[in-house]
Interface confidence: medium
């Protein structure tokens, strides 16, 4: 019944966007976008987990916008759309969009912080800190215990930051933490501190350094 | 004016078959998620089986094997294909069209009676 | 044995306020939307409330819905004779819908 009568590559897929942002807090209103490669007839929004549709919207142009409002954590969750045009055959639609992940939350899980190769390093030498979170995009920041203001600042791509710490002010204990890169902004909760030592130094703490 | 009529239904020996349609007017039927539902003399609903916009077909756990939902789209009807009937299966059968928040039935149908008895 | 669970009965007096519950799971109630449904006798169901607490248009604004983790409830408030038919719950779990066992409302006097 849900066979296209036209190869797949004839109804190419849309691709779902969310407005301001696909990691909110609880309240805020969300925009979920879907942007076909053509003009369509009618759009459909769908949450994994239902198989009915969540949402229809009839246009006649290559977008659609679903609006959620004061959105609170149950809607968080899987979302894809499709698109469909008056001229294909009865039920035939579009190919699914990307997956959209929303997520409605306070506060963003911890991320881990670890020393590549490791916590103990030798005098003088470079460390790298990964911090690493489970959602990609976000901004990461650094911090060394005792100092108020981050030492580092990265927007990823991924859903880690790679941090250099260079030379000889290396040691000492670090800590970060990651945050959406717009408003409105969601933290994470800091991460474990993590102690960066020189070898042969035991566990001589050089928090108050610098 | 949005309509759903079912037929098909009527007494049949056990063991046998019986198929149901259920012809919907006055919205687009392709996009809709559509479903049966039965209900035995003096007892509550029971959902049956469900058709998706996409992808396969679902069943309450007592159907599977034995009913079979399908759709023709360009007719905008639905069908429920029974096989070996049993005594239980006695009950009027509705077909419903589910809405969008998450699998609510917003128009049902007057409902067909399948009886099944020798 | 209906996986969501209602009183089999309720009643009350034209005027007065009653309350049906509908007990369930955190794999149904409290991860979906419940629905509720009124059927007047020999009639089809009809939708009284969805997605936990909406009412479609032309549901008067006396019957109200709720949830709270795995249970929901259906308020009748000004209650009337008309109102005398059974209720149902129902809620979603894994790609099956499930109803309650129906809960028939007596309207006293």
């Known amino acids: 019944d849900f066979t296209p009568t036209a190869p797949l590559a004839s109804y190419p897929q849309p691709w779902l966007g969310a407005h301001p942002a696909a990691v909110v807090t609880p309240g805020i209103n969300v925009t979920l976008t879907c942007r076909a490669p053509q003009s369509a007839w009618r759009f459909a929004l769908f949450k994994s987990g239902l198989v009915t549709p969540l949402l229809l919207r009839d246009v006649s142009v290559e977008l659609a916008e679903f609006f959620l409002e004061e959105v609170t954590p149950a809607q968080g969750g899987s979302y894809h759309c499709r698109y469909r045009k008056t001229d294909w055959g009865p039920g035939v639609w579009s190919q699914p969009s990307n997956v959209l992940e929303l997520l409605v939350t306070d506060q963003l899980p911890r991320p881990s912080l670890v020393a590549l190769p490791g916590p103990v390093v030798a005098p003088g030498a470079n460390v790298s800190l990964r911090c690493a979170g489970r959602i990609p995009g976000m901004s990461f920041a650094l911090y060394r215990v005792g100092v108020a203001t981050p030492l580092q600042y990265i927007d990823s791509v991924q859903p880690w930051a790679d941090f250099l710490l260079i030379g000889t002010h290396t040691p000492g204990t670090y800590c970060c933490y990651y945050h959406t890169p717009s408003a409105p902004y969601v933290l994470s909760q800091r991460s474990q501190p993590l102690v960066i030592s020189f070898e042969g130094s035991g566990s001589l703490d050089y928090t108050q350094g610098n | 004016e949005v309509q759903l009529l079912e037929s098909g239904g009527g007494l049949v020996q056990p063991g046998g078959s019986l198929r149901l349609s259920c012809a919907a007017s006055?919205?687009?039927?392709?996009?809709?998620?559509w479903t049966w539902v039965r209900q035995a003399p003096g007892k509550g609903l029971e959902w049956v089986s469900g058709?998706?916009?996409?992808?396969?077909?679902n069943y309450a756990q007592n159907f599977q094997g034995r009913f079979t939902i399908s759709r023709d789209n360009s007719k905008n009807t639905l069908y429920l294909q029974m096989n070996s009937l049993r005594a239980e299966d006695t009950a009027v059968y509705y077909c419903?069209?589910?809405?969008?928040?998450?699998?609510?039935?917003?128009?049902w149908g007057q409902g067909t009676l399948v009886t099944v008895s020798s | 044995q209906s996986v969501l669970t209602q009183p089999p009965s309720a009643s009350g007096t034209p005027g007065q306020r009653v309350t049906i519950s509908c007990s369930g799971s955190?794999?149904?109630?409290?991860?979906?939307?419940v629905s509720w449904y009124q059927q007047l006798p020999g009639t089809a169901p009809k939708l009284l409330i969805y997605?936990?607490?909406n009412r479609p248009s032309g549901v008067p604004n006396r019957f109200s819905g709720s949830k709270s983790g795995t249970s929901a409830s259906l308020a009748i408030s000004g209650l009337r004779s008309e109102d005398e038919a059974d209720y149902y719950c129902?809620?979603?779990?894994?790609?099956?819908?499930?109803f309650g066992g129906g809960t028939k409302l007596t309207v006293l006097g």
């Open positions: 419903a069209k589910a809405g969008f928040t998450g699998g609510h039935f917003d128009i």
């Open positions: 006055g919205f687009t039927f392709s996009d809709y998620y």
């Open positions: 058709s998706p916009v996409f992808g396969a077909a």
């Open positions: 955190s794999s149904n109630i409290g991860n979906n939307y």
């Open positions: 997605g936990n607490s």
């Open positions: 129902q809620s979603y779990d894994s790609s099956s819908w499930l």
